[in-house]
C-alpha cells in the first residue's frame, strides 16, 4: 500500500436491476483492475420526492475525481442521477449530497442506505 492512501480492494455491491442484469442484489464486490491503477467504490441513487432510491453500488476504475476521497459525496448541483466515488474498502456504504454551490447547510443529511 502507498503511505497515506487507503487502497480499495472491495466495495459494497447493490444493483436495483439485479433480475434484469442477472447479478446478485446485494453483497460485497472484490475490485479488479490493472495492478498499477487505482480502484475506487461508487454509489448511484435517485431522489424521488424526497425518498432515496439506490440504483447501483460497486467498484469504480481509476478516476482522478475520486482520488483521496475517503467519503462518498456527490457535489454536483441537482443531478438527475446522483453519483459519488471514494477510496478505501467499503467507503460507499454511506453516501451524501453536498452541492458545491451551497456554502451553508447541506440540503440533505448523510444517507446510510438500507436497500429495499
Amino acid at each position: 500500500a502507498i503511505l497515506g492512501r487507503s487502497e480499495t480492494q472491495e466495495c459494497i455491491f447493490y444493483n436495483a436491476n439485479w433480475e434484469r442484469d442477472r447479478t446478485n442484489r446485494t453483497g460485497v464486490e472484490p475490485c479488479y483492475g490493472d495492478k498499477d491503477k487505482r480502484r475506487h467504490c461508487f454509489a448511484t441513487w435517485k431522489n424521488i420526492s424526497g425518498s432515496i432510491e439506490i440504483v447501483k453500488q460497486g467498484c469504480w476504475l481509476d478516476d482522478i475525481n475520486c482520488y483521496d476521497r475517503t467519503d462518498c459525496i456527490e457535489k454536483k448541483d441537482s443531478p438527475e442521477v446522483y453519483f459519488c466515488c471514494c477510496e478505501g474498502n467499503m467507503c460507499n456504504e454511506r453516501f451524501s449530497y453536498f452541492p458545491e454551490m451551497e456554502v451553508t447547510q447541506p440540503t440533505s443529511n448523510p444517507v446510510t442506505p438500507k436497500p429495499p
Partner: antibody, heavy 115, light 111 residues
Framework: QVQLVQSGAEVKKPGSSVKVSCKAS????????INWVRQAPGQGLEWMGT????????SYAQKFQGRVTITADTSTSTAYMELSSLRSEDTAVYYC????????WGQGTLVTVSS | QSALTQPRSVSGSPGQSVTISCTGT?????????VNWYQQHPGKAPKLMIY???KRESGVPDRFSGSKSGNTASLTISGLQAEDEADYYC???????????FGGGTKLTVL
C-alpha cells in the same frame, strides 16, 4: 480481456444523423466512463465527449454541444454516439475509449458524409 | 479548453533518445497530473502508453517515460527502435468534472 467493438462503416448525406455503437466486454461496463474521439483523414485526435456509464451523466466538447448525444445501455453494455446535422467536415473515423485515461480503444468506425 | 501544443515532427536514429513536448497552461498541464501519451500507427487505433504524466501503462516497454516541468509535459523514448515510428499524441484525463483535450500530434520518424 477488455474489448470495445464498434459498429460498421457508414455513408451519410449532409444534414442527416449517424449513430455509432460501442459494445464493451471483459470488464464491468458500469465501472467507468466511455469517451468518444474522432479523427478526420490525415488529422489529429479530437475529443467529443464522455459518459459516466452508471449514472448516464455526460459532458461534451463545446464544439459539438447541441449536435452530439452520448448514451449508454447498461443492459447490453453498449455506448452510443449520435451526431446530427452532418456536414462533409464530419467525415472521420470515430473511436470509443474506456475510462478517463482512454486505456482501451474500439477499432474505429469510418463515417463518410457525402452528397 | 484549448488544444495542447506539440511539435509537428521529431526524428532520431535507432538506439538514440528522443523527447516529445506537450505544452499547455497553468490551469491544465501545469496544475494537474493528468496528462497521457498515446501511440498511433497508421490505420490503427491509438494505444495508451503513459498516463498521469509518468505512469507506464501495463505492457509498455520501460524505454518509454513521461515527465513534467511547469506547463510542459514530455515523453522520452530511449533506445529508439524501428517499430517506435508512429504518431504520438498527448491528451488529458476526461470524465466527471474534467473535459478532454488532445495535442495536435507529433510524427516520430526513425531514420
Amino acid at each position: 480481456q477488455v474489448q470495445l467493438v464498434q459498429s460498421g462503416a457508414e455513408v451519410k448525406k449532409p444534414g442527416s444523423s449517424v449513430k455509432v455503437s460501442c459494445k464493451a466486454s471483459g470488464y464491468t461496463f458500469t465501472s467507468s466512463y466511455i469517451n468518444w474521439v474522432r479523427q478526420a483523414p490525415g488529422q489529429g485526435l479530437e475529443w467529443m465527449g464522455t459518459i459516466n456509464a452508471v449514472s448516464g451523466s455526460t459532458s461534451y466538447a463545446q464544439k459539438f454541444q447541441g449536435r452530439v448525444t452520448i448514451t449508454a445501455d447498461t443492459s447490453t453494455s453498449t455506448a452510443y454516439m449520435e451526431l446530427s446535422s452532418l456536414r462533409s467536415e464530419d467525415t472521420a473515423v470515430y473511436y470509443c475509449a474506456r475510462g478517463g485515461w482512454f486505456d482501451y480503444w474500439g477499432q474505429g468506425t469510418l463515417v463518410t458524409v457525402s452528397s | 479548453q484549448s488544444a495542447l501544443t506539440q511539435p509537428r515532427s521529431v526524428s532520431g536514429s535507432p538506439g538514440q533518445s528522443v523527447t516529445i513536448s506537450c505544452t499547455g497552461t497553468s490551469s491544465d498541464v501545469g496544475s494537474k497530473n493528468y496528462v497521457n501519451w498515446y501511440q498511433q500507427h497508421p490505420g490503427k487505433a491509438p494505444k495508451l502508453m503513459i498516463y498521469g504524466v509518468s505512469k507506464r501503462e501495463s505492457g509498455v516497454p520501460d524505454r518509454f517515460s513521461g515527465s513534467k516541468s511547469g506547463n510542459t509535459a514530455s515523453l522520452t523514448i530511449s533506445g529508439l527502435q524501428a517499430e517506435d515510428e508512429a504518431d504520438y499524441y498527448c491528451g488529458t484525463f476526461a470524465g466527471g468534472k474534467y473535459y478532454g483535450v488532445f495535442g495536435g500530434g507529433t510524427k516520430l520518424t526513425v531514420l
